[in-house]
Amino acid sequence: ATKLTEEKYELKEGQTLDVKCDYTLEKFASSQKAWQIIRDGEMPKTLACTERPSKNSHPVQVGRIILEDYHDHGLLRVRMVNLQVEDSGLYQCVIYQPPKEPHMLFDRIRLVVTKGFSGTPGSNENSTQNVYKIPPTTTKALCPLYTSPRTVTQAPPKSTADVSTPDSEINLTNVTDIIRVPVFN
């Protein structure tokens, strides 16, 4: 079994973590995918997930987390905007494949968020942008739990992460629609 590996990213409060998790295109394109934080003792907590089935290039926002699944590139893009010190932790992308265990996309991301601000170049000003402010909403049944195994039997594809400047609003490039997670009461 392959040992779980990590990539460390040190960012400042207010910045955006931008992670691309690769997956096998043909096999997992329409599978539901999720972003999880690993609690103490290898206990993943699901923070956000795509629709089921996952739609191509269709952003889903849950609080400060935005997921976008690019089927034609075989990658899940995860953005955490306006980072806070409390966001520091170990994260992973997973693909749900019930009733089997989730398929983890590697490497895991060790996020360290520190106080203060370090500016980085902004996004391309010439690109067409729509700005969305989505309130945090809740549903009990949206994401299955499906606990994750500790090791895998195949070599992990890489995750990549970028940094962008902070913004009180979320800029989604060339987006015509965004999924609002329904409220459950």
């Epitope: 609690r39 103490d40 003792g41 290898e42 206990m43 907590k45 699901t46 923070l47 956000a48 997930c49 849950v62 609080g63 400060r64 987390i65 955490m80 806070q84 409390e86 966001d87 009733p99 265990e101 309130p135 945090p136 909403t137 809740t138 549903t139 009990k140 049944a141 949206l142 994401c143 299955p144 739990l145 499906y146 606990t147 994750s148 195994p149 500790r150």
Partner: antibody, heavy 120, light 111 residues
Framework: QVQLVQSGAEVKKPGASVKVSCKAS????????MHWVRQAPGQGLEWMGV????????SYAQKFQGRVTMTRDTSTSTVYMELSSLRSEDTAVYYC?????????????WGQGTTVTVSS | DIVMTQSPLSLPVTPGEPASISCRSS???????????LDWYLQKPGQSPQVLIY???NRASGVPDRFSGSGSGTDFTLKISRVEAEDVGVYYC????????FGGGTKVEIK
């Protein structure tokens, strides 16, 4: 229906160990974390730890580190909580509780409780 | 560790009247996904606890709509719009943001 059934009451001597079981039924055992919570007589609830029944990994409250061991048997859909080096302060009702699915981390199903008495 | 502080310790209530319990955490329970990891439980006399509210404001299945949860960050409130006799027991808040910690409990009893 979803149910957690715990083992019966125990009386132990100080310094001994106790092992409490919690048998799950009515749902997919490996898809939900299981917590252990205790309650001393006349006191509030105290979280002890959690086990992932799928892989068997655990996370314990700092207070119980080194004294508590949580295990599971997937063939019988049962989780176990063993507490060693017992002292009188460990006299309590011990509950197992299932953690909800998805975003929800509430403990949505509870066992009936197991009374453990530590007395010389 | 996060410390959870509940008030009041004891709450004598009159059936049909509203009731309110406060819970304060020593750290913010708001996660990056916009959810407050704060739950409310009721332990009726001689019974196991049962969940009332999860993620700060969401009623658990089968819980009457007279129960509601509100708040964000570090300050949370459980409200009972019209107390009924069956609502007596000890109410606990619990945080699930960093590990799991229960508040000390609030005993609700009929006047």
């Amino acid at each position: 229906q979803v149910q957690l059934v715990q083992s019966g009451a125990e009386v132990k001597k100080p310094g001994a160990s106790v092992k409490v079981s919690c048998k799950a039924s009515g749902y997919t055992f490996t898809s939900y974390y299981m917590h252990w919570v205790r309650q001393a007589p006349g006191q509030g609830l105290e979280w002890m730890g959690v086990i992932n029944p799928s892989g068997g990994s655990t996370s314990y409250a700092q207070k119980f580190q080194g004294r508590v061991t949580m295990t599971r048997d997937t063939s019988t859909s049962t989780v176990y909580m063993e507490l060693s080096s017992l002292r009188s302060e460990d006299t309590a009702v011990y509950y197992c509780a299932r953690e909800g699915s998805g975003y929800d981390e509430s403990m949505d199903v509870w066992g009936q409780g197991t009374t453990v008495t530590v007395s010389s | 560790d996060i410390v959870m502080t509940q008030s009041p310790l004891s709450l004598p209530v009159t059936p049909g009247e509203p009731a309110s319990i406060s819970c304060r955490s020593s750290q913010s329970l708001l996660h990056s996904n916009g959810y407050n990891y704060l739950d409310w439980y009721l332990q009726k006399p001689g019974q196991s606890p049962q969940v009332l509210i999860y993620l700060g404001s969401n009623r658990a299945s089968g819980v009457p709509d007279r129960f509601s949860g509100s708040g964000s960050g570090t300050d949370f409130t459980l409200k009972i719009s019209r107390v009924e006799a069956e609502d007596v027991g000890v109410y606990y808040c619990m945080q699930a943001r960093h590990g799991f910690t229960f508040g000390g409990g609030t005993k609700v009893e009929i006047k």
